[in-house]
């Protein structure tokens, strides 16, 4: 094949390389740029800055490299629009720092700085961290400080992420109220800071004040929903970023639900919980307070993180007629209290009984097609029976 | 599958305290069961000693309520027996066991 | 009473059916379990509520229950099933356990 004239040509089905000296002073417009997946680039003395909008379009871009060229900055951002790279030779440039945003997001499994005039500072403690822990190839460049000894020796005892202290009413929050959270940011070189609300969405009305180093947050309005929601304060420096999430509890009245009894592999009266604090919980049976036992027992499901509401079983173990009944759950918490009953029959009396037996009541079955071992249950329709037993 | 295995002192001076673990393994003993501990002086029946649930419910046999105590360690996925004020008639094989139908039982430790 | 009375012991011709019984108030309000044991071993559950049999017990053996009467009934007896066996339940409260006091199977 004829040699390319051009500042950069073709490698493979989907590679550029940029070699020819001095041709590129960005990389605006570079030809074919949306099926790379290899750019590589060397010698271009004009090339200095790596931006946002240098790299847009190049999306499928897994592997870069930029070589003995100019390159004096690259953007915090600069591969926003390049997620799937994960070489980075930037070897040989003259680059004096990379902000830990540059790489942040990205799962790199090479990142090549040799060769580099670096200066020694907190900006570099990522770097010094990846090679500590042995990432990306890292430890292997044995990196330099420009007239500062190697990266490794840096002092690294001053330079630590932002320390954030979130402040929340200590004072028992109720539906209605309007509640003010503060966030305090200490520590060096403070770049940005704010407030993470994703999670409220219709849980209260938000208003932000203030600023670095004291950002505030009005949470007006509150309702229940906003029980074990995420409210994230944020702030980031030249080393790092920090994130410290606090949650409101919004106090509210205990309430409750009962369903009818399922049989699964055992039987299940299900119900669901719900309260700020959560409530304590109590299950009678016909009036009575029910003990619960192995074969009788409350059983919760697995609670969702983010809501209040908790659901689950008062369990019955192979339940006979003794266990037929009115089932109340009372529910309680210092804001109010609630029950609900419901009616369970599990099956006519499975022992053959005499004639000088009590008469037990049935009430009204559960209709269900049983697999299991245990007593067939009752089919008929009336909505309560009395069982006789005729001498 | 579930396995459990008691351990503790096999000798316990009068008046003292008898303590025995049970160790779960196989399974996690925060799951939907109940554990008892179940006893057998040599030559004699079963006796029921107590059963308790993770969320810390439990239940005693009538004739030892006063003496014992039964509580889970959910971080170390056991439970554990302590009976107080131990005479000779104390003296039994004891076996912890998976509540309500006892189908899975430690091999059991004489005391 | 909250308590299981069981014969101290049965006998039983090698091939033949043999019934255990346990007797007791309870057992009109509930199930009982039946535990196989043999010396120097735990006990291993054989028969629970109805007629539940876990996997691993031969289906010679079965239960049965009537009036307050519970029943475990090996069908063929085998010179393995050579046991102590114990049944349980709940006491008349269903708030406690309570064993019955257990019966010697010896087959001849």
């Known amino acids: 094949a004829a040699p390319c004239p051009d500042a950069c040509c073709p490698h493979g089905s989907s590679g550029l390389r940029c070699t020819r000296d001095g041709a590129l002073d960005s990389l605006h417009h570079l030809p074919g740029a949306e099926n790379l997946t290899e750019l590589y680039i060397e010698n271009q003395q004009h090339l200095q800055h790596l931006e946002l909008r240098d790299l847009r379009g190049l999306g499928e871009l897994r592997n870069l490299t930029i070589v003995k060229s100019g390159l004096r900055f690259v953007a915090p951002d600069a591969f926003h629009f390049t997620p799937r790279l994960s070489r980075l030779n930037l070897s040989f440039n003259a680059l004096e720092s990379l902000s830990w945003k540059t790489v942040q997001g990205l799962s790199l499994q090479e990142l090549v700085l040799s060769g580099n005039p670096l200066h020694c500072s907190c900006a570099l403690r990522w770097l010094q961290r990846w090679e500590e822990e042995g990432l990306g190839g890292v430890p292997e460049q044995k990196l330099q400080c420009h007239g500062q000894g190697p990266l490794a020796h840096m002092p690294n005892a001053s330079c630590g992420v932002p320390t954030l202290k979130v402040q929340v009413p200590n004072a028992s929050v109720d539906v209605g109220d309007d509640v003010l959270l503060r966030c305090q940011v200490e520590g060096r070189g403070l770049e940005q800071a704010g407030w993470i609300l994703t999670e409220l969405e219709q849980s209260a009305t938000v208003m932000k004040s203030g600023g670095l180093p004291s950002l505030g947050l009005t949470l007006a309005n509150v309702t229940s929903d906003l029980n074990r929601k995420n409210v994230t304060c944020w702030a980031e420096n030249d080393v790092g970023r920090a994130e410290v999430s606090v949650q409101v509890n919004v106090s509210f009245p205990a309430s409750v639900q009962l369903h009818t009894a399922v049989e699964m592999h055992h039987w299940c009266i299900p119900f669901s919980v719900d309260g700020q604090p959560a409530p304590s919980l109590r299950w009678l049976f016909n009036g009575s307070v029910l003990n619960e036992t192995s074969f009788i027992f409350t059983e919760f499901l697995e609670p969702a993180a983010n809501e209040t509401v908790r659901h689950g079983c008062l369990r019955l173990n192979q339940p006979t007629h003794v266990n037929n009944g009115n089932y109340t759950l009372l529910a309680a918490n210092p804001f109010g209290q609630a029950s609900a009953s419901i009616m369970a029959a599990f099956m006519d009396n499975p022992f053959e009984f005499n004639p000088e037996d009590p008469i037990p009541v049935s009430f009204s079955p559960v209709d269900t097609n049983s697999t299991s071992g245990d007593p067939v249950e009752k089919k008929d329709e009336t909505p309560f029976g009395v069982s006789v037993a005729v001498g | 599958q579930v396995q459990l295995q008691e351990s503790g002192p096999g000798l316990v001076k009068p008046s003292g305290t008898l303590s025995l673990t049970c160790a779960v393994s196989g399974g996690s003993i925060s799951s939907s069961n109940w554990w008892t501990w179940v006893r057998q002086p040599p030559g004699k029946g079963l006796e029921w000693i107590g059963e308790?649930?993770?969320?810390?419910?439990?239940n005693y046999n009538p004739s030892l309520k006063s003496r014992v105590t039964i509580s889970v360690d959910k971080s170390k996925n056991q439970f554990s027996l302590k009976l107080s004020s131990v005479t000779a008639a104390d003296t039994a094989v004891y076996y912890c066991?998976?509540?309500?139908?006892?189908?899975?039982w430690g091999q059991g430790t004489l005391v | 009473s909250s308590e299981l009375t069981q014969d101290p012991a049965v006998s039983v011709a090698l091939g033949q059916t043999v019934r255990i019984t346990c007797q007791g108030d309870?057992?009109?309000?509930?199930?009982a379990s039946w535990y196989q044991q043999k010396p120097g071993q735990a006990p291993v559950l054989v028969i629970h509520g109805k007629n539940n049999r876990p996997s691993g017990i031969p289906d010679r053996f079965s239960g049965s229950s009537s009036g307050n009467t519970a029943s475990l009934t090996i069908t063929g007896a085998q010179a393995e099933d050579e046991a102590d066996y114990y049944c349980?339940?709940?006491?008349?409260?269903?708030?406690?356990?309570?064993f019955g006091g257990g019966t010697k199977l010896t087959v001849l």
């Open positions: 066991a998976r509540a309500p139908f006892f189908d899975r």
């Open positions: 309870s057992l009109r309000s509930y199930y």
């Open positions: 308790i649930y993770h969320r810390g419910n439990r």
């Open positions: 349980n339940s709940q006491d008349s409260s269903g708030n406690h356990l309570i």
